[in-house]
Amino acid sequence: LPLNSSTSLEKNNVLFGERYLEKFYGLEINKLPVTKMKYSGNLMKEKIQEMQHFLGLKVTGQLDTSTLEMMHAPRCGVPDVHHFREMPGGPVWRKHYITYRINNYTPDMNREDVDYAIRKAFQVWSNVTPLKFSKINTGMADILVVFARGAHGDFHAFDGKGGILAHAFGPGSGIGGDAHFDEDEFWTTHSGGTNLFLTAVHEIGHSLGLGHSSDPKAVMFPTYKYVDINTFRLSADDIRGIQSLYGDPKENQRLPNPDNSEPALCDPNLSFDAVTTVGNKIFFFKDRFFWLKVSERPKTSVNLISSLWPTLPSGIEAAYEIEARNQVFLFKDDKYWLISNLRPEPNYPKSIHSFGFPNFVKKIDAAVFNPRFYRTYFFVDNQYWRYDERRQMMDPGYPKLITKNFQGIGPKIDAVFYSKNKYYYFFQGSNQFEYDFLLQRITKTLKSNSWFGC
């Protein structure tokens, strides 16, 4: 197994590591046959790397001290395995008025303090969205707040003091939306024990449809860390995530459409999944649609992806063009498609790992080719890789942090394209940043749909 001999880790650390990776990163322990130590060691190493990458640790593939410390840190019980900001398939509440009910109260705190902490936690999210929350005392609420210990009626039993503090379910009927807090923790209004308000803000994020963030400053980061509740604020990543689901606090906000009907082009909260140039046109991808913008012309047209490329999926996540080769690369999950002269090439999709990504990379957020350097930049979570298109291999020294090398951009991005020989256009939620890569700074901030004359 991938043990670092210098730290002389005991067997129980390995077992603890296995259990942690099973619970939060999908390591299948029944696929770790003792008779195949090399095979099982590789599986475990991959999962350690995945965890280290997601939680911002040095990626060693070893159960080193900092990794074990992180594994022992108190945390949310929801797995990190998806690497998404929004939960898969994006379950969201299809209404703006959401009810909650506190099913039972922890004896650790006064009832009024529990009520206040939960109310303030909901308020954190209503402040940045059009959502309104109201507490009910009887009947069926959308979100049920429960204090429970051990097994408590779902698939995910609590584990006693420490370890998992709480968990919550994404929007939906029945158990959907419910937030469970481990009664074996000592819940408090302050820095001692476990702060209920801070934990509730995180869990309510899940109740509204958010997954875990790999940004350590985000409230949706998986592990618990006390911060001063009087000065607490959501990170930019949290706000981007929740507003990508519900929009900002403006009245009469359009809800995400359950039937995936055509998004409103001039919706001020419109975000894009991927953007790329194709010759003198710009393609903007969203769900199963794309808009076609011919450079310098105001007119745009919306099309179904399937109408142009019937064999391609909806929900394209990243795209880039190598104009000199008349090639466009389209990415979804761990696969990519090659389009040549606007026609899909046979024998695709292929795995993104053929570019040389490590196995823990499961999807690409955005990609852009720079013809000056003949390099493609791949953005994954809060990091990016640089790929040499001539040598067909990754440049050494990557990944690097987006925020370190693209001043004012990040920690994550939705889409990016290259234009006018010197600009990258980065998309983050409903915002767009014109970035001069020679000056290495943002030169303009725009709305994502500014290209359409909105």
Epitope: G26, P79, V81, G90, M140, G153, D154, A168, G170, I175
Partner: antibody, heavy 122, light 103 residues
């Protein structure tokens, strides 16, 4: 309309292997948790295994842990159950069922297939 | 571990009768209880979720109640098509079933 159709059942000797499939249609398969539930002849229902929408996380009943492997191919809208080291007590009708969206399973089985019979006997 | 105990295990009743089936958990499961109906040779069908919410398309003669450890499924006026086996369930645990037969 949501449809789930199991296949792959049959007669197998103790210690043998079998792979069940469940073809899904009528919903966005890649958004949902999927589960396997079984029912021995004349007996009650027993939960067997579940898998997260992305396929990266799985759960098993103690009775099958280490012997059965659940997996899915979202591009084919298909759920699988690989059953190894089969025992007589694994004889049952195996149903696949659709759970909820999201990172966590609810155990709320909204839709069920018709089932496929697995008989383990020498 | 949580266990679910269903009673009775079988029950004879007539068309038009009011029937109640109970399910008890050995510790609190809040309102996380579902009820399914299964007819011979068929797959189970969801009737009630979250203890009292009627699944879409299920007739209103079916109702559920309870929270914590004690739950009931009530059929207000039995119809011929209701003779079947009923299971309570939470997460990965099913009750042993109640077979409802014609008297």
């Amino acid at each position: 309309e949501v449809q789930l159709l199991e296949s792959g059942g049959g007669l197998v000797q103790p210690g043998g292997s079998l792979r069940l499939s469940c073809a899904a249609s009528g919903f966005t398969f890649s958004h949902y948790w999927m589960q396997w539930v079984r029912q021995a002849p004349g007996k009650g229902l027993e939960w067997v295994s579940g898998i997260v929408p992305s396929g990266g996380l799985t759960m098993y009943a103690d009775s099958v842990k280490g012997r059965f492997t659940i997996s899915r191919d979202n591009s084919k809208n298909t759920l699988y159950l690989q059953m190894n080291s089969l025992r007589a007590e694994d004889t049952a009708v195996y149903y696949c069922a659709r759970d909820i969206m999201g990172a966590y399973a609810s155990g709320l089985f909204h839709n069920w297939g018709r089932g496929t019979l697995v008989t383990v006997s020498s | 571990d949580i266990q679910m105990t269903q009673s009775p295990s079988s029950l004879s009743a007539s068309v038009g009768d009011r029937v109640t089936i109970t399910c008890r958990a050995n510790q609190s499961i809040y309102t996380y209880l579902n009820w399914y109906q299964q007819k011979p040779g068929k797959a189970p069908e969801l009737l009630i979720y979250a203890a009292s919410s009627l699944q879409s398309g299920v007739p209103s003669r079916f109702s559920g109640s309870g929270s914590g450890t004690d739950f009931t499924l009530t059929i207000s006026s039995l119809q011929p098509e209701d003779f079947a086996t009923y299971y309570c369930q939470q997460a990965g645990i099913f009750g042993q079933g109640t077979k409802l037969e014609i008297k």
